[in-house]
C-alpha cells in the first residue's frame, strides 16, 4: 500500500490556445486530468488501472501551481494504491479548458483539450522527487513525481506492514525496510521480552519490565542470588531456599532450641556458676549460703535444725546459737541433766534408764524422733526425689511430685516421649533432654514426619529451552515454567507468532 504523488509546478500556454489551435475565450481556464496505469511500451487509452485524479481550475493560460491546496484541489496530487508497487508505471496528464463550472468529462466538448502528455518507465519507492518537463509546440508542463509508502507500510514495494507499538504485544519502532527495531530495554522477535537488570540471576530472577530484577519464590536481594530461610526458622540462615541452618548456640529443626541458655538468659543468681546441659537446660552451682534451682534462695544456718532436745536456734553473724530447754545443755543441747523420773520423753515415747539411772534414752513411736521424741519425722530431709522432684510428707510416709517427663517413686525414671509413637510415616523416634526428635524416611519431613516432601522430580532436568523446573509436592512430578516463546509439558515446542 502506498501513494503515487504528482506535483504540478508550472504550465505555459503563452498564446492561450487549445490543441486544435483555436484560441480560448477569453483565456484558457486550465485544469488537469491525471491517469496512472500499469506499464505499457506504447501508452494507449484505456482504464487507469492504478488510479486517476482531476484538479479544479488551477489558472489561466500560463501559471505556476502552488505547493498546497488550490481551490479545493491538492498539490501534490495523490494517487493511492493498495497493492505491492510493481516498480513500473504509465502516466497520462491532460490539460483541459473549462468554459463553465462543470468539469465532468461528459459536460465538456472534445475540443476543449489543451494538451496531453504520456510517459512510462521504472520508478522505485523513495522520498526523492523526479523532476520532468514535457513540451509541445504550443505548451510546456513542468512537474515532479514519486512513490512513497502509506503509513505503517515499508520495504521496496510497500508490501511490509509494520505498526510501531509500545504495549503488552510489543515495544518497537519500524526501520525503513519494515523490520522491527526494539525500544531500549526490550528484546525478542516482537520485542516483548524485557531485558532484566544487569546481573539478575538467570534462574532465580525474572522481570516484567526493563532493568527490573524480580525474584522467584525463595530468593531475595537486588540480583535474586540470596536465599530466604524457612518460614518457621528462628535463629538460622540458608544456603538454598527454605533451609534453616542454625546460628551458633541454637539447635532444633527451626533453630529455636537454645543451646547456650547460660549466655542468652543468665539464669543463675547470687554469683552462682552456670553450666549448659542441653537444649534449654542448665545447672546452677551455688555459692555457700545459697540454694534453689537458680541459687535464688539464701540459706539460714538454722535451716538444718542443729539444736537437739527441743532447743531453739538463733541465727548469728558468725553462725548460730542454741537456746536449750530446762534439763539440757551443750552446743546443740545434746547433754541431759534429766532422768526417767522427770518423764522426759514426749509424744508417747517410752523411757529407758542408762548408766545406773545417770542418764536415759527415749524409744519413740513412729513419726517422731529426737532424743526426747520431740520432733516430727521429716522424711524429706534426705532429698530423696531425683530430677528436681518435690518431696511431700504424707503422715508416716513421703511421696515425690515429679517434674514433667519423669516418673517412679523417686522420679528416677525418664518418661519416654517416644512411647506414644509420635513419628508419622515410619519415622524413627529419639528421646532428647528437650523432648523428642523424629528422623524421617525419604519423602517426608516436619517435626513429626507429617509433611510429604517431594523426591526431587527436577533432578533429571526434564525441562527444555531454559525453562524453570518446579516439583509438584502433591504428585511428586515436575512442572516446567516455560520462557516466552515455548509451550508443552517440557517447554519443548516453540510458538510461531504472526506479526501483530
Amino acid at each position: 500500500s502506498g501513494v503515487f504523488q504528482l506535483q504540478l509546478q508550472e504550465f505555459v500556454n503563452e498564446r492561450g490556445v487549445l490543441a486544435s489551435g483555436r484560441p480560448c475565450e477569453p483565456g484558457c481556464r486550465t485544469f488537469f486530468r491525471v491517469c496512472l496505469k500499469h506499464f505499457q511500451a506504447v501508452v494507449s487509452p484505456g482504464p487507469c488501472t492504478f488510479g486517476s485524479v482531476s484538479t479544479p481550475v488551477l489558472g489561466t493560460n500560463s501559471f505556476a501551481v502552488r505547493d498546497d491546496s488550490s481551490g479545493g484541489g491538492r498539490n501534490p496530487l495523490q494517487l493511492p494504491f493498495n497493492f505491492t508497487w510493481p516498480g513500473t508505471f504509465s502516466l497520462i496528464i491532460e490539460a483541459w479548458h473549462a468554459p463553465g463550472d462543470d468539469l465532468r468529462p461528459e459536460a465538456l466538448p472534445p475540443d476543449a483539450l489543451i494538451s496531453k502528455i504520456a510517459i512510462q518507465g521504472s520508478l522505485a519507492v523513495g522520498q526523492n522527487w523526479l523532476l520532468d518537463e514535457q513540451t509541445s509546440t504550443l505548451t510546456r508542463l513542468r512537474y515532479s513525481y514519486r512513490v512513497i509508502c502509506s503509513d505503517n507500510y515499508y520495504g521496496d514495494n510497500c508490501s511490509r506492514l509494520c505498526k510501531k507499538r509500545n504495549d503488552h504485544f510489543g515495544h518497537y519502532v519500524c526501520q525503513p525496510d519494515g523490520n522491527l527495531s526494539c525500544l531500549p530495554g526490550w528484546t525478542g522477535e516482537y520485542c516483548q521480552q524485557p531485558i532484566c537488570l544487569s546481573g539478575c540471576h538467570e534462574q532465580n530472577g525474572y522481570c516484567s519490565k526493563p532493568a527490573e530484577c524480580l525474584c522467584r519464590p525463595g530468593w531475595q536481594g537486588r540480583l535474586c542470588n540470596e536465599c530466604i530461610p524457612h518460614n518457621g526458622c528462628r535463629h538460622g540462615t540458608c544456603s538454598t531456599p527454605w533451609q534453616c541452618t542454625c546460628d551458633e548456640g541454637w539447635g532444633g529443626l527451626f533453630c529455636d532450641q537454645d543451646l547456650n541458655y547460660c549466655t542468652h538468659h543468665s539464669p543463675c543468681k547470687n554469683g552462682a556458676t552456670c553450666s549448659n546441659s542441653g537444649q534449654r537446660s542448665y545447672t546452677c552451682t551455688c555459692r555457700p549460703g545459697y540454694t534453689g534451682v537458680d541459687c535464688e534462695l539464701e540459706l539460714s544456718e538454722c535451716d538444718s535444725n542443729p539444736c537437739r532436745n527441743g532447743g531453739s536456734c538463733k541465727d548469728q553473724e558468725d553462725g548460730y546459737h542454741c537456746l536449750c530447754p530446762p534439763g539440757y545443755y551443750g552446743l546443740h543441747c545434746e547433754h541431759s541433766t534429766l532422768s526417767c523420773a522427770d518423764s522426759p520423753c514426749f509424744n508417747g515415747g517410752s523411757c529407758r534408764e542408762r548408766n545406773q539411772g545417770a542418764s536415759y534414752a527415749c524409744e519413740c513411736p513412729p513419726n517422731f524422733t529426737g532424743s526426747n521424741c520431740e520432733k516430727k519425722v521429716d522424711r524429706c530431709t534426705s532429698n530423696p526425689c531425683a530430677n528436681g522432684g518435690q518431696c511431700l510428707n504424707r503422715g508416716p510416709s513421703r511421696m515425690c511430685r515429679c517434674r514433667p517427663g519423669f516418673t517412679g517413686t523417686y522420679c528416677e525414671r525418664h518418661v519416654s516421649d517416644c512411647a506414644r509413637n509420635p513419628c508419622a510415616h515410619g519415622g524413627t523416634c529419639h528421646d532428647l533432654e528437650s523432648g523428642l526428635m523424629c528422623t524421617c524416611p525419604a519423602g517426608f519431613s516436619g517435626r513429626r514426619c507429617e509433611v510429604r516432601t517431594s523426591i526431587d522430580a527436577c533432578a533429571s532436568s526434564p525441562c527444555f529451552n531454559r525453562a524453570t523446573c518446579y516439583t509438584d509436592l502433591s504428585t511428586d512430578t515436575f512442572v516446567c515454567n516455560c520462557p516466552y516463546g515455548f509451550v508443552g509439558s517440557r517447554c519443548e515446542f516453540p510458538v510461531g507468532l504472526p506479526p501483530s
Epitope: G218, Q220, R222, E226, I228, P229, N231, C233, Y470, S474
Partner: antibody, heavy 118, light 107 residues
Framework: EVQLVESGGGLVQPGRSMKLSCAAS????????MAWVRQAPTRGLEWVAT????????YYRDSVKGRFTISRDNAKSTLYLQVNSLRSEDTATYYC???????????WGQGTLVTVSS | DIQMTQSPASLSASLGETVTIECRAS??????LAWYQQKPGNSPQLLIF???NLADGVPSRFSGSGSGTQSSLKINSLQSEDVASYFC?????????FGGGTKLELK
C-alpha cells in the same frame, strides 16, 4: 517466642507525614526479609513494601511508590516505614510482617492504625 | 497483577462440620499459595504455605490442596475457636496479592 510490635500510628491530615516502627524479637532479625502489609475495611489485605535481609533491596506497591520508604536497623532489630504525602486511601491498619513479596508472611505484629483525615 | 477470588465471602457452619473455602487465581501460581486465619480483633496468622504445608503449631484438622489456578482450605470437625476470617494469598508473581476473605461463623 517471635514478637513484632508496631508503633507510630495515629490521626494525621492529608499531605502530612509519619514514621511507623516495628520492634522485632524472638528471632535473628538480620537473617530475614521483612514487609509491611495493610488492611482497610474497604480494600482488604494489601502488601505495601518489602526489604531484603541480604542487601536492603526495597520493593513497593505502585500506589505508594515515591511516597513510602521502608528501612531497617539490624542493630536495633527494628523495621521502619516512613510515610509521606498521605492520602485518605492510605487509611488502614498497618502490620509489620516477616516475609518477602515471594514468600508467605510467617509472623505478624498486632498492627498500628493510621487514619488520614482532615 | 494476579487477581485472587475467594468464595464464599461468608459462611455459617455447625460445630463438628467439615468446611471448605475456595480460592481462584487469575493465572497459574504453581502452588505458591498461603492461607491465613484472622480472629476478630487480632492480626492474621499463617495457617498453610505452599498450598498444602501446615505452618508450625497449626492443628491437623486444617488442610490445603490445589494446583494451577484452583486452591482450597478444608477444616475438618469445626471447633468454636475456628470462628475467624480466612484469606488466601499468592506469592508466585510480583506483586503478592490476597483474596477478599471468607468470614466463617457458627450456626
Amino acid at each position: 517466642e517471635v514478637q513484632l510490635v508496631e508503633s507510630g500510628g495515629g490521626l494525621v491530615q492529608p499531605g502530612r507525614s509519619m514514621k511507623l516502627s516495628c520492634a522485632a524479637s524472638g528471632f535473628t532479625f538480620r537473617n530475614f526479609p521483612m514487609a509491611w502489609v495493610r488492611q482497610a475495611p474497604t480494600r482488604g489485605l494489601e502488601w505495601v513494601a518489602t526489604i531484603s535481609s541480604s542487601d536492603g533491596t526495597t520493593y513497593y506497591r505502585d500506589s505508594v511508590k515515591g511516597r513510602f520508604t521502608i528501612s531497617r536497623d539490624n542493630a536495633k532489630s527494628t523495621l521502619y516505614l516512613q510515610v509521606n504525602s498521605l492520602r485518605s486511601e492510605d487509611t488502614a491498619t498497618y502490620y509489620c510482617s516477616r516475609g518477602y513479596y515471594n514468600s508467605p508472611f510467617a509472623y505478624w505484629g498486632q498492627g498500628t492504625l493510621v487514619t488520614v483525615s482532615s | 497483577d494476579i487477581q485472587m477470588t475467594q468464595s464464599p465471602a461468608s459462611l455459617s457452619a455447625s460445630l463438628g462440620e467439615t468446611v471448605t473455602i475456595e480460592c481462584r487465581a487469575s493465572e497459574d501460581i504453581y502452588s505458591n499459595l498461603a492461607w491465613y486465619q484472622q480472629k476478630p480483633g487480632n492480626s492474621p496468622q499463617l495457617l498453610i504455605f505452599d498450598t498444602n504445608n501446615l505452618a508450625d503449631g497449626v492443628p491437623s484438622r486444617f488442610s490445603g490442596s490445589g494446583s494451577g489456578t484452583q486452591s482450597s482450605l478444608k477444616i475438618n470437625s469445626l471447633q468454636s475457636e475456628d470462628v475467624a476470617s480466612y484469606f488466601c494469598q499468592q506469592y508466585n508473581n510480583y506483586p503478592p496479592t490476597f483474596g477478599g476473605g471468607t468470614k466463617l461463623e457458627l450456626k
